[in-house]
């Protein structure tokens, strides 16, 4: 698998991993203990046919060609959780690894 | 999770899973022996905030607004495999199952 | 440099009730959860309680459930542990921390003795 | 609630010496497990969070290891600093517990 990295100095316009620090702070999440913030990144970009296409099933839709089935989109393909000490609503502080909070890779889907 | 069904009668605009059968032959793919249809489903529709989210992260860059990043779209964010007899290119008949073939659910990612 | 300074601790008799204060200083109070732990005299540790870093969450241990409470002021930098009806067992020195993934910054403590 | 078992309570050992503590917890905590330093009188110090991060300013000598319901603190070198009373943490759900301590002394 492979997918693009950029950041915002880059003048790429396809489908492209940019950085992005989620500040839980700023969001007044005060739930959370911990992380403070974390580096999260984001997708961003045009999906030319083909391009980065992480399913067969994408180029197949795409010959199909099916009413109202728009492009395939710059999305999360590859992701990681993190660790975070948080309050559970119910009194209770909580450890846990949240899956799919880190983007590690876009493609086209 | 949770994922909305729809057919082509539906009036539903919100990010939903279609029925359709990609067919093979039609697309004058003759190196796939079998099978010679199968049903692939897609995914389309409109991505409201929140809506059918299948990441927090989704949730979180929409917070945290970066430059560039576009709002969720409709991916499939469940698939399945199908087994498939076909000729590799190389005067071979291989049977094999190949990922993520069928949409078994869509959501906004 | 981060420093916290517990006070208010001293004798009270069983039944009675002590309010602790906690003062912050040397980092951003309203961005962290703070917690309270205490250690009876020649024992080990017991947590006692954590607040959110707005104040909107609360945690206990049964132990002290329903008798403690902690609370904070922003706007002063400051702790606070409200304990009522209590008990011989809940001598002890009480630390404030500073509250991430684990306590990293503790205070020197304050003693509160309860008997008659 | 989780209880957490250190040991041993007490060791005696020389300057320069491999030190390792260990805490069982009795379920899994994942990697959520702090070690404190204590010195008499004092107020405890955090050493490592999450089973095995140094906090900032602890020197490298101070290592922590284990995930599940194993945890080991190692003290690779031993320095005259180092003879305190260490203590393990679960911070995986609260009621948050702590171990009964070691008390490493100067053989």
């Known amino acids: 698998d492979f997918g693009l990295d950029c950041d915002e100095h880059s003048t790429e316009s396809r489908c492209c991993r940019y950085p992005l620090t989620v500040d839980f702070e700023a969001f007044g999440w005060d739930w959370i203990i911990a992380p403070k913030r974390y580096k999260a990144n984001y997708c961003s970009g045009e999906c030319e046919f083909v391009f980065l296409q992480k399913y067969p099933h994408t180029h197949l839709v795409h010959q199909a060609n099916p009413r109202g089935s728009a492009g395939p989109c710059c999305t999360p393909t590859k992701m990681s959780p993190i660790n975070m000490l948080y309050f559970n609503g119910k009194e209770q502080i909580i450890y846990g690894k949240i899956p799919a909070m880190v983007v590690d890779r876009c493609g086209c889907s | 999770d949770f994922g909305l069904d729809c057919d082509e009668h539906s009036t539903e605009s919100r990010c939903c899973r279609y029925p359709l059968t990609v067919d093979f032959e039609a697309f004058g793919w003759d190196w796939i022996i079998a099978p010679k249809r199968y049903k692939a489903n897609y995914c389309s529709g409109e991505c409201e905030f929140v809506f059918l989210q299948k990441y927090p992260h989704t949730h979180l860059v929409h917070q945290a607004n970066p430059r560039g990043s576009a709002g969720p779209c409709c991916t499939p964010t469940k698939m399945s495999p199908i087994n498939m007899l076909y000729f590799n290119g190389k005067e071979q008949i291989i049977y094999g199952k190949i990922p993520a073939m069928v949409v078994d659910r869509c959501g906004c990612s | 440099e981060v420093q916290l300074l517990e006070s208010g601790g001293g004798l009270v008799q069983p039944g009675g009730s002590l309010r602790l204060s906690c003062a912050a200083s040397?980092?951003?109070?309203?961005?962290?959860?703070m917690s309270w732990v205490r250690q009876a005299p020649g024992k080990g540790l017991e947590w006692v309680s954590t607040?959110?870093?707005?104040?909107?969450?609360?945690s206990y241990p049964d132990s002290v459930k329903g008798r403690f409470t902690i609370s904070r002021d922003n706007s002063k930098n400051t702790l606070y542990l409200q304990m009522n009806s209590l008990r011989a067992e809940d001598t002890a020195v009480y630390y404030c921390?500073?509250?991430?993934?684990?306590?990293?910054?503790w205070g020197q403590g304050t003693l509160v003795t309860v008997s008659s | 609630d989780i209880q957490m078992t250190q040991s041993p309570s007490s060791l005696s050992a020389s300057v320069g010496d491999r030190v390792t503590i260990t805490c069982k917890a009795s379920q899994d905590v994942s990697t959520a497990v702090a070690w404190y330093q204590q010195k008499p009188g004092k107020a405890p110090k955090l050493l490592i969070y999450s089973a095995s991060y140094r906090y900032t300013g602890v020197p490298s000598r101070f290592s922590g290891s284990g995930s599940g319901t194993d945890f080991t603190l190692t003290i690779s070198s031993l320095q005259p600093e180092d003879f305190a009373t260490y203590y393990c943490q679960q911070h995986y759900s609260t009621p948050w517990t702590f171990g009964g301590g070691t008390k490493v002394e100067i053989k």
């Open positions: 607040i959110s870093s707005g104040g909107s969450y609360t």
């Open positions: 921390a500073k509250q991430d993934y684990a306590m990293n910054y």
């Open positions: 040397g980092f951003t109070f309203s961005s962290y959860a």
